[in-house]
Interface confidence: low
């Protein structure tokens, strides 16, 4: 008769590091002590006639256990295969490129350490929750890759790596581990340079707006802009509208920047740069400054009028040009009454890169002279009718402007000057018309002959 040695449980599955209770039993009536052969840590828990129970601890790897017993001098054996399963110790998605150009491929790499049995372990690469690749875990550590074509929609998308340990056939379920997600930044930077709008000329100590625009940029809000006048960085205000970036700055030229300069605009995105440059000439245009040796001159004195401007500037004073650019134009005159209020005009011309820039300035001369009454405007003999309306048309001149009063001789009676008034016979007589100012007096005699009103 053939006797059997049973090992229970048969082909068990347990998690790594776990313990297992094993029972070996035989139907042989005259069996000796049952032995358990294994490389695992074991402990005899109990035994009896034809049976023995053992506890296996810290089971870390797949293993085969063997029970044996002598029955009537013959050895009989029984075995069981232990399958150990374990979750991966590490699931890591490799860092993504800092910036990824849209339309170009990039590689997702996932590394998995540990996890058993490998035949039941699958590695899945994901964008959001979308599966991009599903591959078995092979080597230790397992490394799986997938090539992805970057799109605008991928900007900000999380990519991750998931492991699936499928122990469902053994009735233990599906064990899932997921890596920390990594976010991708995609970008579009057109090959065209930015559009740079800047002045051709810029005067020292003046300001002018500079605009730099680049279309077709994604994401425009992440782009960095550098605007500079020569080596002087400009403070730019950056605005985004859709895929268009506009940087605006105010360029102010310093005196030490005079001459040929460049305005530079750099737009950087995703570690790439697009640049535009424009030539600009910084110039200094001082003046023209018109000076009078005496802004207020006395009649008969000599007055010098001069006009000057900066280097390389040609000035012309009242039509008379200076001898050469950068030199002063000058004229002299004897101040007369007719020069009072006279304006002297100076024009200045500067050539900058073949273009002529013009500026004008003027100054007004004041000449001080005594009061005068113009005889032509002040008739010395007036014949007016009684009870009629008239104007005494006398005008005085002088600087400072004189006061003009007409008083009747022998009385303090005053007639208005330059204002209509009603004439009557009492106005008959001789009048002293006197113009007076701080520079003296001037008197003119005016006779009023009033013809009495005759009623027929």
């Amino acid at each position: 008769q053939e006797f059997l040695l049973r090992v229970e449980p048969q082909n068990p599955v347990l998690s790594a590091g776990g313990s297992l209770f094993v029972n070996c039993s035989t139907d042989c009536p005259s069996s000796e002590k049952i032995a358990l052969e294994t490389s695992l840590s074991k402990e005899l828990v109990a035994s009896g006639m034809g049976w023995a129970a053992f506890n296996l601890s810290n089971v870390t790897g797949n293993s085969r256990i063997l029970c044996s017993v002598y029955c009537n001098g013959s050895q009989i054996t029984g075995s069981s295969n232990i399958t150990v399963y374990g979750l991966p110790e590490r699931v890591e998605l490799a860092p993504l490129p800092p910036w990824q150009p849209v339309g170009q491929n990039f590689t997702l790499r996932c590394q998995v350490e540990g996890g058993s049995p490998r035949t039941s372990l699958t590695v899945v690469l994901l964008r959001w929750e979308e599966e991009l690749s599903r591959q078995p875990a092979v080597e230790e550590p397992a490394e799986v890759t997938a090539t992805v074509l970057a799109s605008r929609d991928d900007h900000g998308a999380p990519f991750s790596c998931r492991t699936e340990l499928d122990m469902q056939p053994q009735g233990l379920g599906l064990f899932v581990n997921t890596s920390a997600p990594r976010q991708l930044r995609t970008f579009v930077l057109p090959v065209t340079p930015p559009r740079l709008v800047a002045p051709r000329f810029l005067e020292v100590e003046t300001s002018w707006p500079v605009d730099c625009t680049l279309d077709g940029l994604f994401p425009a809000s992440e782009a960095q802009v550098y605007l500079a006048l020569g080596d002087q960085m400009l403070n730019a205000t950056v605005m985004n509208h859709g895929d268009t970036l506009t940087a605006t700055a105010t360029a102010t030229a310093r005196a030490d920047q005079e001459g040929a300069r460049e305005i530079v605009c750099n737009v950087t995105l995703g570690g790439e740069r697009r640049e535009a440059r424009e030539n600009l000439t910084v110039f200094s245009f001082l003046g023209p400054i018109v000076n009078l040796s005496e802004p207020t001159a006395h009649e008969g004195s000599t007055v010098t009028v001069s006009c000057m401007a900066g280097a390389r500037v040609q000035v012309t004073l009242d039509g008379v040009p200076a001898a050469a650019p950068g030199q002063t134009a000058q004229l002299q005159l004897n101040a007369t009454e007719s020069d009072d209020g006279r304006s002297f005009f100076c024009s200045a011309t500067l050539e900058v890169d073949g273009e002529f820039l013009h500026r004008n300035s003027s100054v007004q001369l004041r000449v001080l002279y005594g009061p005068k009454i113009d005889r032509a405007t002040c008739p010395q003999h007036l014949k007016w009718k009684d009870k009629t309306r008239h104007v005494l048309q006398c005008q005085a001149r002088g600087n400072p402007y004189p006061e003009l009063r007409c008083l009747k001789e022998g009385s303090s009676r005053e007639v208005p000057v330059g204002i209509p008034f009603f004439v009557n016979v009492t106005h008959n007589g001789t009048y002293q018309c006197q113009a007076s100012s701080s520079r003296g007096k001037y008197t003119l005699v005016v006779v009023m002959d009033i013809e009495a009103f005759s009623s027929h």
Epitope: R152, D153, H155, G156, Q183, R185, F218, P219, S221, E222, Q224, V225, Y226, N235, A236, V238, M239, N240, G242, T268
Partner: antibody
Framework: EVQLQQSGPELVKPGASVKISCKAS????????ILWVKQSHGKGLEWIGK????????TYNLKFKGKATLTVDKSSSTAHMQLNSLTSEDSAVYYC????????????WGQGTSVTVSS | DAVMTQTPLSLPVSLGDQASISCRSS???????????LHWYLQKPGQSPQLLIY???NRFSGVPDRFSGSGSGTDFTLKLSRVEAEDLGVYFC?????????FGGGTKLEIK
């Protein structure tokens, strides 16, 4: 451990300028954006601007353009903010903060620098 | 600029209570890339602001799960499931979708 250590309190006269600093440690300085925020009693929190230490490029809130100038010194991992033509309106606590490109929020803040403008 | 309006201004609560803070933006905070850059910060008395929630609903590392964020477009909410003493302070919402970045006026969470 990420840290942003700001310079001490400042008492300045109207019309003067002040430069406050923010020293970063515990991470690669050029990997994150540095931002500056003003906190005053009347106005709450106001974003002044940001600077990318890698490129040195800046973006300002138009309200603070001309008032604040942001710079960095990569060699010492320090960000600076200069405030010009100070008035009593500029009296506030100023914070520096950092943000990574993601999560795109100010994840670490300095302890703040108090600026008082008074004659 | 995107104007952020927070309600209420003050929120008296008892410890263990639930609390809810609302934040409304004057314009949509959905970025062209589809993300919504709305964040929540807490400023405890005498301290700097600290990040709680980024991009509407993501808890920053070390933030307890009693904090949660929700919302879309222009309307957002921060909820505390059980208020603890360490949660007291001023809560700010903030957006970084549009330049300039802007903050809400703050909501003071205090004990009843």
């Amino acid at each position: 451990e990420v840290q942003l250590q700001q310079s001490g309190p400042e008492l300045v006269k109207p019309g003067a300028s002040v430069k406050i600093s923010c020293k970063a440690s515990g991470y690669t300085f050029t990997d994150c954006i540095i931002l500056w925020v003003k906190q005053s009693h009347g106005k709450g929190l106001e974003w002044i601007g940001k600077i990318n230490p890698y490129f040195g490029t800046t973006t300002y809130n138009l309200k603070f353009k001309g008032k604040a100038t942001l710079t960095v010194d990569k060699s010492s991992s320090t960000a600076h903010m200069q405030l010009n033509s100070l008035t009593s309106e500029d009296s506030a606590v100023y914070y520096c903060a950092r943000k990574e490109a993601y999560p795109d929020a100010m994840d670490y803040w300095g302890q703040g620098t108090s600026v008082t403008v008074s004659s | 600029d995107a104007v952020m309006t927070q309600t209420p201004l003050s929120l008296p609560v008892s410890l263990g209570d639930q609390a809810s803070i609302s934040c409304r933006s004057s314009q949509s905070l959905v970025h062209s890339n589809g993300d919504t850059y709305l964040h929540w910060y807490l400023q405890k008395p005498g301290q700097s602001p600290q990040l709680l929630i980024y991009k509407v609903s993501n808890r920053f590392s070390g933030v307890p799960d009693r904090f949660s964020g929700s919302g879309s477009g222009t309307d957002f909410t921060l909820k505390l499931s059980r208020v603890e003493a360490e949660d007291l302070g001023v809560y700010f919402c903030s957006q970084s979708t549009h330049v300039p970045y802007t903050f809400g006026g703050g909501t003071k969470l205090e004990i009843k």
